[in-house]
């Protein structure tokens, strides 16, 4: 006998039986629980009978023989049709057919539902000639056959550019239920029906879905896959599986968790990341969302002062980036502040309030009744004014600025002065005769200058002129400061 | 709609056997199972046990093992509840209801009354 | 097997009032079903899992409750609630019921 393949050259009979081989884990499920029913082996059924006429395509030869007896039709013999086996299980069968000898370079190929078997599959092909004719014995085998190798398989030989084909052989793999669809984890609003789908399929079919909630069965009568569950609503987190029985037995599919949506926690580690004059840049860390996305967040922030009226302004802000500015503060004061921040069931509580401070700013208005005039004795212009009003000084005031601008017959010139705080009066020499001088005063504060008030201007004039009445800011209401000479 | 309806009173001996039938109606038969509930006299609810329309396979409560037997047949949508060697303390009413998912007893029959009395 | 307790035993009430009855469980059940049964009928299934009312229930009753405490409230008593309620848990294997709460006109 002649082997294709390096093995030692058997017989091998047509119907086969169990094929022992590894037994592989792939695609096991978390748990599964075959029925103890012990070894089973494969189940056979022949569609046709024996002897019968072969049904698939048969090819006759054209050839005569020497004594020109046509040649007989050739087909593939009959073999098993359906085979039944579980999971994990080998199997071996194969296609047998007897073929003149006068034909050259006969191969068989393997296919599986309409497509060729190729590379490294389990097939031999075996020869055994005789005088007239060589017997041609092709198997196929699966050492541990999975769901996949479930499907129709037939050979195919070509001669004389004619294809024979075999009768099919149907692989019907059997195993535990094999889930196609889980429930899946889901966070839920309290009190509030949902459902949960389980699907799962064999072969064998029918398959049967029990649901387990917190190790407790929900329904004690199967229900066929699919299934959905109507969960009636929660009021605590509980635990869901699914059971898939057939019958090879059960499978058991991954346990989720299902949470109730609840408020959020309050926001933790309020934290100052810069502070100016009138505004305080804050950052928190979100608390535990409840199950539930953040919307958004209100910052609360209120004088520390215990003088003052206690009311709280509100800011609200998108829930990220836990970042906030908070403007329209008040210059060198005291803040509680606190965060908060709401899913879809509501506001968390409060963070701890933390305490904060603006910084200095520059004043916020100019020096008040800025009042000008000419002391020509001692050729100097006397400045005169009230300081702002201290809720708008933004700080402590260090003193003030005094810009004087001397303008005469094209020519300008600014100066500026810098006075200490104390008092509201200040003396410049006269720089220029005959030209117009313009003064403004600002406030300031170690946190800046402050706004300068409007331009008081007076003439000066050259020397030998009579005295002036001052030049002061004008009333509320004016639009053009006033010179008065 | 869906209906459960019980077979009649039965009045018997000490030792006898009683057989109560619950025939259901408005719902596929097989796809909720059947509990028995007892109500002594004056008393509260016991629960008894179930049967599984779809297997066959009763289930029972510590307290109605033995002589108690629940069977279906399944052609006419009935279940049935079967007391065998009867004693006085065996009078009660006993319900059918459907039992469904999370057991729930959604809908009950009119109720047996079996009288155990010599 | 888990013990449920009901109370009131036997609650006396007037037509309009709000009536309030507790079932409480030995040990944490998933959730509690009611029933109300009137003398010489079946009972009828009022609110099953915790909360929610079964077909037909009037709005006035409603459930609450988790773990081992449950209620069962009539917001406004109607002359046709005088009746015995039952509550019943799933969560453990056997159910149980509780021993039963009558509730009489005053």
């Known amino acids: 006998a002649i082997t294709e393949a390096r093995e030692e050259a058997k017989p091998y009979p047509l119907f086969p039986g169990p094929f022992p081989g590894s037994l592989q884990t792939d695609h096991t499920p978390l748990l599964s629980l075959p029925h103890a029913s012990g070894y089973q082996p494969a189940l056979m059924f022949s569609p046709t009978q024996p002897g019968r006429p072969h049904t698939g395509n048969v090819a006759i030869p054209q050839v005569t023989s020497v004594e020109s007896k046509p040649l007989p039709p050739l087909a593939f013999k009959h073999t098993v049709g359906h085979i039944i086996l579980s999971e994990h299980k080998g199997v071996k069968f194969n296609c047998s057919i007897s073929v003149p000898n006068i034909y050259q370079d006969t191969t068989i190929s393997w296919w599986k539902d309409g497509k060729e078997l190729l590379g490294a599959h389990h097939a031999i092909t075996q020869f055994y000639p005789d005088d007239e004719v060589t017997a041609i014995i092709a198997s196929f085998s699966i050492t541990s056959v999975q769901r996949s190798d479930n499907g129709s398989y037939i050979c195919k030989m070509k001669i004389n550019n004619e294809e024979i084909v075999s009768d099919p052989i149907y692989i019907e793999v059997q195993g535990l239920p094999h889930f196609t669809k889980q429930p899946e984890s889901m966070n839920v609003t309290r009190n509030t029906a949902f459902n949960l789908t389980c699907q799962a399929v064999g072969p064998p079919e029918p398959v049967n879905i029990f649901w387990v909630q917190n190790s407790s069965r929900v329904n004690e009568q199967p229900e066929k896959s699919p299934s959905v569950l109507t969960v009636p609503g929660l009021t605590e987190m509980a635990v869901f599986s699914c059971e898939a029985h057939n019958d090879k037995g059960l499978t058991v599919s991954k346990g989720v968790q299902i949470n109730i949506k609840a408020i959020p926690s309050p926001p933790t580690e309020v934290s100052i990341r810069n502070s100016t004059a009138h505004s305080i840049l804050i950052s928190w860390v979100p608390g535990f969302d409840g199950y539930s996305p953040f919307r958004n967040c209100s910052i609360q922030v209120k004088e520390a002062d215990p003088l003052s009226n206690g009311s709280v302004m509100i800011f609200n802000t998108s829930a990220l980036p836990h970042l906030y500015q908070i403007k329209q503060l008040q210059a060198l004061a005291n803040y509680s502040i606190g965060v908060s921040c709401m899913n879809e069931i509501g506001w968390s509580a409060v963070s701890p309030w933390i305490l904060a401070s603006t910084t200095e700013g520059a004043p916020s208005v100019a020096p008040l009744n800025v009042t000008v005039f000419l002391n020509e004795s001692s050729d100097n212009v006397d400045i005169r004014w009230m300081k702002p009003p201290t809720k708008q000084q933004d700080g402590e005031l260090v003193g003030y600025r005094i810009s004087h601008v001397w303008q005469s017959a094209g020519i300008s010139k600014e100066l500026l002065e810098e006075v200490g705080q104390n008092g509201s009066r200040a003396r410049i020499s006269v720089q220029v005769h005959n030209a117009t001088c313009t003064v403004r005063i600002a406030a300031v504060t170690r946190g800046g200058v402050g706004p300068f008030s409007d331009p008081v201007k007076i003439f000066i004039p050259a020397h030998g002129w009579v005295d002036y009445a001052p030049s002061s800011t004008p009333a509320p209401g004016n639009a053009d400061p006033v010179l008065i000479i | 709609q869906v209906q459960l309806v019980q077979s009649g009173s039965e009045l018997k001996k000490p030792g006898a056997s009683v057989k109560v039938s619950c025939k259901a109606s408005g719902y596929i038969f097989t796809t909720y199972g059947l509990s028995w509930v007892r109500q002594a006299p004056g008393q509260g609810l016991e629960w008894m046990g179930w049967?599984?329309?779809?297997?066959?396979?009763?289930t029972y409560t510590d307290d109605f093992k033995g002589r108690f037997v629940f069977s279906l047949d399944t052609n006419v949508s009935t279940a049935y509840l079967q007391i065998s060697s009867l004693k006085a303390e065996d009078t009660a009413v006993y319900y059918c209801?459907?039992?469904?998912?999370?057991?729930?007893?959604?809908?009950w029959g009119q109720g047996t009354l079996v009288t155990v009395s010599s | 097997d888990i013990q449920l307790t009901q109370s009131p035993s036997f609650p006396s009430a007037s037509v309009g009032d709000r009536v309030t009855i507790t079932c409480r469980a030995s040990s944490s059940v998933g959730y509690m079903h009611w029933y109300q049964q009137k003398p010489g009928k079946a009972p009828k299934l009022l609110i099953y899992?915790?909360?929610n009312l079964a077909q037909g229930v009037p709005s006035r009753f409603s459930g609450s409750g988790s773990g081992t405490e449950f209620t069962l409230t009539i917001s406004s008593l109607q002359p046709e609630d005088f009746a015995t309620y039952y509550c019943q848990q799933w969560g453990s294997l056997p159910f149980t019921f509780g021993q039963g709460t009558k509730l009489e006109i005053k």
């Open positions: 209801a459907r039992y469904t998912n999370y057991g729930v007893f959604d809908y």
């Open positions: 049967i599984n329309t779809y297997s066959g396979v009763p």
């Open positions: 899992a915790t909360s």
